[in-house]
Interface confidence: medium
């Protein structure tokens, strides 16, 4: 089958060396080519170039269109470390540092405690927080952490929420929260996250972030 | 450059007393918790006392509860621990470290710690 498909491919060869020489020999003159054949042969060889030049046009477009939906869709992503903080407030800062991401200014972090985004979409957000508490030190509720959304002319709301017991180790237990969600943001929306008691957030490296990503 | 500087190690007698100090620099020391972990010969990291950033709660290991006083002063951005009644078994290389952390350590956990402080208890 091999053998039979070069032999295929050295006719096919052949036979395109002997139109393009017919081509040559049309546009020097020669007498033993008739009139006819030569218009039919021209006409065959302008087809096949347009073809080539309008495949070549499609592909420029679709190069630019691509180019076009690139700059209408950015990606957009945001991660970020938390930050300890002298404030008394439960809202979580955070802060462009160590393994950090801010992919362009379409999404910013604002006072250190929210990331605001410009562009209206689809967004997965997420947040870990990593807290050391113990039972007898802690009030009776538990450690909770609350993904919130602030968007323009609207009230802040809940988006997700966690919530943890306090452990009964000494000094304290360590316990990670996850949160994460597919929401549709507006322009000028914010997220920022909240807790129960700021002071129990562990804020060594890889322990406490928050982030997002436009889908 | 995040700096912790344990100091006032040594040699004393059993019921002696010692005062340890660990100065930090290099990160904002008021809003952490801190805490002392200490390794003795052949060991591995024990905890022995943990107090909160604004020194208002403090906690102890059985093992040195009545007899050991930690404390901080934020002003200075200094860490202290008051050690009375030593045993020969408090001997160690004591460490500081940022304290939001539970009680089972190995090194590599601790953001902020120290190179440590030798006390050895022995008559």
């Known amino acids: 089958h091999r053998r039979l498909d070069k032999i295929e491919d050295e006719r096919n060869l052949h036979e395109d060396f002997v139109f393009m020489k017919t081509i040559q020999r049309c546009n020097t003159g020669e007498r033993s080519l008739s009139l006819l054949n030569c218009e039919e042969i021209k006409s065959q060889f302008e087809g096949f170039v347009k073809d080539i030049m309008l495949n070549k046009e499609e592909t420029k477009k679709e190069n630019s269109f691509e180019m076009q939906k690139g700059d209408q869709n950015p990606q957009i992503a945001a991660h970020v470390i938390s930050e300890a903080s002298s404030k008394t407030t439960s809202v979580l800062q955070w802060a462009e540092k160590g393994y950090y991401t801010m992919s362009n200014n379409l999404v910013t972090l604002e006072n250190g405690k929210q990331l605001t985004v410009k562009r209206q979409g689809l967004y997965y957000i997420y947040a870990q927080v990593t807290f050391c508490s113990n039972r007898e030190a802690s009030s009776q509720a538990p450690f909770i952490a609350s993904l919130c959304l602030k968007s323009p002319g609207r009230f802040e709301r809940i988006l997700l929420r966690a919530a943890n017991t306090h452990s009964s180790a000494k000094p304290c237990g360590q316990q990670s929260i996850h949160l994460g969600g597919v929401f549709e943001l507006q322009p000028g929306a914010s997220v920022f996250v909240n807790v129960t008691d700021p002071s129990q957030v562990s804020h060594g490296t890889g322990f406490t972030s928050f982030g997002l990503l436009k889908l | 450059e995040v700096q912790l500087l344990e100091s006032g190690g040594g040699l004393v007698q059993p019921g002696g007393s010692l005062r340890l100090s660990c100065a930090a620099s290099g990160f904002t020391f008021a809003f952490y918790p801190m805490m002392w972990v200490r390794q003795a010969p052949g060991k591995g990291l024990e905890w022995v006392s943990w107090?909160?950033?604004?020194?208002?709660?403090?906690y102890y290991a059985d093992s040195v509860k009545g007899r050991f006083t930690i404390s901080r002063d934020n002003s200075k951005n200094t860490l202290y621990l008051q050690m009375n009644s030593l045993r020969a078994e408090d001997t160690a290389v004591y460490y500081c470290?940022?304290?939001?952390?539970?009680?089972?350590?190995?090194?590599?956990?601790?953001?902020?710690w120290g190179q440590g402080t030798l006390v050895t208890v022995s008559s």
């Open positions: 470290a940022e304290g939001n952390y539970g009680s089972s350590y190995t090194m590599g956990v601790f953001d902020y």
């Open positions: 107090i909160d950033a604004t020194g208002t709660r403090t």
